[in-house]
Amino acid sequence: FERTRSLQDPCSNCPAGTFCDNNRNQICSPCPPNSFSSAGGQRTCDICRQCKGVFRTRKECSSTSNAECDCTPGFHCLGAGCSMCEQDCKQGQELTKKGCKDCCFGTFNDQKRGICRPWTNCSLDGKSVLVNGTKERDVVCGPSPADLSPGASSVTPPAPAREPGHSPQ
């Protein structure tokens, strides 16, 4: 019975971008301006999201798909679907309640967002510091001090050549 009823339901014939208008004998009517339906058989169209202020339109709303927002230059999105915008900082900084502040010694941030993270402690892996860390970059760990004893080579062999047109996975 349910299956029969759904087959006879005139609304199931209404495509995306339309809605089944109960006020007009269940005729498929186009979605009104600033609304959309992304699937067929809808009894109403959804209101489009509006991107204003700190948000800017990344994708315009159409009759079949919602608008998508991102943040204006100098900001980055937070939350799924960009529900909030947070100020960018420079690499080597983090955003605090007092604004963008340089990373403390021993920490780094290689992005315009997020927090400063501690440099890697090479000695925990039995390695030595090959390249010192900065505010913007983590330290680079090299071979352990024992590996650098006289006679031991500290030069790593070259990576095998890749065929042209193949990128690393």
């Epitope: 209101i47 700190v54 204006t72 937070l78």
Partner: antibody, heavy 115, light 107 residues
Framework: QVQLQESGPGLVKPSETLSLTCTVS????????VHWIRQPPGKGLEWIGA???????DYNAAFISRVTISVDTSKNQFSLKLSSVTAADTAVYYC?????????WGQGTLVTVSS | EIVLTQSPATLSLSPGERATLSCKAS??????VSWYQQKPGQAPRLLIY???NRYTGIPARFSGSGSGTDFTLTISSLEPEDFAVYYC?????????FGQGTRLEIK
């Protein structure tokens, strides 16, 4: 530190114009906009309107005929003007920075409309 | 305009109990709902944005869920400082709107 502070007369006569300012610090007025929101005593929150970083404005249709929001970047201030006030406009008025979700609010200022 | 309806209007619970607050939207608002806490004489304070993201510095006992038209704020174990009024707000479409609030009081 991000700070917003509303100020203005606490008492306004009916039919006159309510004028409030929102003085901000800790962020640039050319980077962020500001929203004005009000709360009548013992009631919920009502969005009045906003001014964006570029200077354009959006208003709640319920206020559009009598509201003006503006910015004075030299003074680090946003302003709200609401004309032809009645007792129904008695409320705490807040400004809040535009970041998409109202993370930073002023402490609010109570405006009473009475003769 | 999008209407947000919060329930219950008042919730009476004891410290340590779990609080569940509801917010229903008259239209689909995706996940663009925020939750605010307001104490007497203070401005609202952002707790949750994007329906489920805890704002900076908000304790882990606060969590949000939902999408579309039905949203929930849960406080897993009530602390004495949690008794306040809670508002949901939508940032999906203009005019921006708020629920009428849920008062969380000590039983």
């Amino acid at each position: 530190q991000v700070q917003l502070q509303e100020s203005g007369p606490g008492l306004v006569k009916p039919s006159e114009t309510l004028s409030l300012t929102c003085t901000v610090s800790g962020f640039s007025l050319t980077t962020y906009g500001v929203h004005w929101i009000r709360q009548p005593p013992g009631k919920g929150l009502e969005w009045i309107g906003a001014i964006w970083s570029g200077g354009s404005t959006d208003y709640n249709a319920a206020f559009i005929s009598r509201v003006t929001i503006s910015v004075d970047t030299s003074k680090n201030q946003f302003s709200l003007k609401l004309s032809s006030v009645t007792a129904a406009d008695t409320a705490v008025y807040y400004c809040a920075r535009d970041d998409g979700s109202f993370a930073n609010w002023g402490q609010g200022t109570l405006v009473t409309v009475s003769s | 305009e999008i209407v947000l309806t919060q329930s219950p209007a008042t919730l009476s619970l004891s410290p340590g109990e779990r609080a569940t607050l509801s917010c229903k939207a008259s239209e689909n608002v995706g996940t663009y709902v925020s939750w605010y806490q307001q104490k007497p004489g203070q401005a609202p304070r952002l707790l949750i944005y994007g329906a489920s993201n805890r704002y900076t510095g908000i304790p882990a006992r606060f969590s949000g869920s939902g999408s579309g038209t039905d949203f929930t704020l849960t406080i897993s174990s009530l602390e004495p400082e949690d008794f306040a009024v809670y508002y949901c707000g939508q940032t999906y479409s203009y005019p921006l709107t708020f629920g009428q609030g849920t008062r969380l009081e000590i039983k």
